[in-house]
């Protein structure tokens, strides 16, 4: 879930399931002010989903958005 009231978006929990990669439009990382590290995926339907940056699928999605294998 996201802290919607604050200017800084933080992840308090992470998605428990892998999002299909073709649903992902973009991502951003949470602030160092947050208590937990996080990656927030923005879906093509404009949903924001918190994901655990220590999970391999999250890392791969970020690489695929930014870089090429």
């Amino acid at each position: 879930s996201l802290a919607a009231d604050t200017p800084t978006a933080c992840c308090f929990s992470y998605t428990s399931r892998q999002i299909p990669q073709n649903f992902i439009a973009d991502y951003f990382e949470t602030s160092s002010q947050c208590s937990k590290p996080g990656v927030i995926f923005l879906t093509k339907r404009s949903r924001q989903v918190c994901a655990d940056p220590s999970e391999e699928w999250v890392q791969k999605y970020v690489s695929d958005l930014e870089l090429s294998a």
């Epitope: 990382e29 590290p37 940056p53 220590s54 890392q59 970020v62």
Partner: nanobody, 113 residues
Framework: EVQLVESGGGLVQAGGSLRLSCAAS????????MHWYRQAPGEQRELVAG???????SYADSVKGRFTISRDNAKNTVYLQMNGLKPEDTAVYYC???????WGQGTQVTVSS
């Protein structure tokens, strides 16, 4: 608190090589993807290479085939081997841990023609 210290930069002629190192503390980096970024004067910071916790690597098109990212989990360190350097590779190079909004001081790479 996550701390990152980059080193290994310097002045090198075009076609030369450098190996950058990034030592991390305050975190077990083996769990996370590590990325190398660079920022040239007047330009935006750009991601050049990444390595996942599982060892999968990926690169920006501009450095593919010339740069190699690797990691030593026992040393909490990530490396960037840069071969065939070009003047356009001149920049300050930074490493970053995915999910942690922390940056080191960077290391300057200057490639002369």
């Amino acid at each position: 608190e996550v701390q990152l210290v980059e080193s290994g930069g310097g002045l090198v002629q075009a076609g030369g090589s450098l190996r950058l190192s990034c030592a991390a503390s305050g975190i077990i980096t083996s769990r996370y993807a590590m990325h190398w970024y660079r920022q040239a004067p007047g330009e935006q910071r750009e991601l050049v290479a990444g390595i996942t916790s599982g060892g999968s690597t990926s690169y920006a098109d501009s450095v593919k085939g010339r740069f190699t990212i690797s990691r030593d989990n026992a040393k909490n360190t990530v490396y960037l081997q840069m071969n065939g350097l070009k003047p356009e590779d001149t920049a300050v190079y930074y490493c970053k841990v995915l999910g942690f909004d922390r940056w080191g001081q960077g290391t300057q790479v200057t490639v002369s023609s």
